[in-house]
């Protein structure tokens, strides 16, 4: 009797997910830290020549809070981008029904702290679109798995998530 | 520092339209993440929230009250307002307008408040 | 509608710890804020985030909220804390509990 192949005939478990938990980060590392999003670049301004790095996401999947009533939150770096969309798909097949939802983007207010990475567009907070907070801890996870590279369980009402700069070495290599 | 101002009728007959202003001084309205509220109490003691206004006119309302409340914001004059319609006896109180702040996702605080009008609704 | 509940007063012994809860489901996932509200007085913000102190604010109050219950401590209650106590919570509805009155004997 001939043994299946290496990894041939085995059933694949799905990848037990447990959730953050509350103040917890993940790596467990500083944000603008090499080994996380990296360093603050500066602040992007509407007039600023690094405006144009910014792109708006229109994915229907996101819901958008929006308090500001002017767009802001919609826009981030590609990569942020990319990461969202990815997070977008899973939280929907983690709860049918669901959708994930931003309440906080690019910020041009100035009400985050000093060198805040929601400043250049590459920080978004999050929670589900129906704001059961029962559900945060694992809505980290799914954010973790989707490629954020960082994810802070920071309050009771939202996930914090950022990602490296477009022109950082990690990110164009895809680490 | 920043003070907030109530002013308007002490007495309302009943069926009538009641209508508060704030005004806010030693700082901007338009000044993001804070939420111009409404807050009302009634003689037996209880704090009832009315409703609130960010700068960008986005309102939220108490349930129970949002068929009869509008809450209104002039950037120019650094004010807020309420309007309450069909007011009854049960609309007796002291008003008081008041500073929310943002703790999470409308999570509000309210950390500063005006010294409240009383306002009396009868024939 | 969400409601929070209060006892409606509490006695403490000057010097002593005056603790007073709010109740409310899951009200853990919620941030608590609690005021303090002297006859004829405006309330005033003691605790929030529920936690913290807002400038000013003496450090004998503190605050904390987990599972159903929040709780607003005074350690070492003063004659002067002497008061009604609101706590409130909610998410894009804010809601008071129905308020304590302390009473430092």
């Known amino acids: 009797i001939i043994g299946p192949g290496r990894g041939f005939g085995k059933r694949r478990h799905p990848k037990k997910l447990t959730p953050l938990a509350y103040k917890q980060f993940i790596p467990n590392v500083a944000e603008k830290t090499l080994g996380a999003s990296g360093r603050y670049e500066g602040k992007i301004t509407r007039n600023s020549e690094r405006f144009k790095e910014l792109t708006p996401n229109y994915n229907p999947d996101i819901i958008f809070k929006d308090e500001e009533n002017t767009g802001a939150d919609r826009l981030m770096t590609q990569r942020c981008k990319d990461k969202l969309n990815a997070l977008a798909i899973s939280v929907m097949n983690q709860w049918p029904g669901v959708k994930l939802r931003v309440t906080e983007g690019w910020d041009e207010d100035g009400h985050h702290s000093e060198e805040s990475l929601h400043y250049e567009g590459r920080a978004v907070d999050i929670t589900t679109s129906d704001r059961d907070r029962s559900k945060y801890g694992m809505l980290a996870r799914l954010a973790v798995e989707a490629g954020f590279d960082w994810v802070y369980y920071e309050s009771k009402a939202h996930i914090h998530c950022s990602v490296k700069a477009e022109n950082s070495v990690a990110a164009k290599s895809g680490g | 520092q920043v003070q907030l101002q109530e002013s308007g009728p002490g007495l309302v007959k009943p069926s009538q339209t009641l209508s508060l202003t704030c005004t806010v001084s030693g700082g901007s309205i338009n000044s993001g993440g804070f939420y111009w509220s409404w807050i009302r109490q009634h003689p037996g003691k209880n704090l009832e929230w009315i409703g609130s206004?960010?700068?960008?006119?986005?309102?939220y309302y108490n349930p129970s009250l949002k068929s009869r409340v509008t809450i209104s914001v002039d950037t120019s004059k650094n004010q807020f307002s309420l309007k309450l319609t069909s007011v009854t006896a049960a609309d007796t109180a002291v008003y008081y307008c008041a500073r929310g702040n943002d703790s999470g996702d409308y999570d509000w605080y309210f950390d500063l408040w005006g010294r409240g009008t009383l306002v009396t609704v009868s024939s | 509608s969400y409601e929070l509940t209060q006892p409606p007063s509490v006695s403490v012994s000057p010097g002593q710890t005056a603790s007073i809860t709010c109740s409310g489901e899951?009200?853990?996932?919620?941030?608590v804020c609690w005021y303090q509200q002297k006859p004829g007085q405006s309330p005033v913000l003691v605790i929030f985030?529920?936690?913290k102190r807002p400038s000013g604010i003496p450090e004998r109050f503190s605050g904390s909220n987990s599972g159903n219950t929040a709780t607003l401590t005074i350690s070492g209650a003063q004659a002067m804390d002497e008061a009604d106590y609101y706590c409130q919570a909610g998410d894009s509805s804010a809601v008071f509990g129905g308020g304590t009155k302390l009473t430092v004997l």
């Open positions: 206004i960010y700068y960008s006119g986005n309102t």
């Open positions: 985030h529920d936690n």
């Open positions: 899951k009200l853990g996932y919620k941030y």
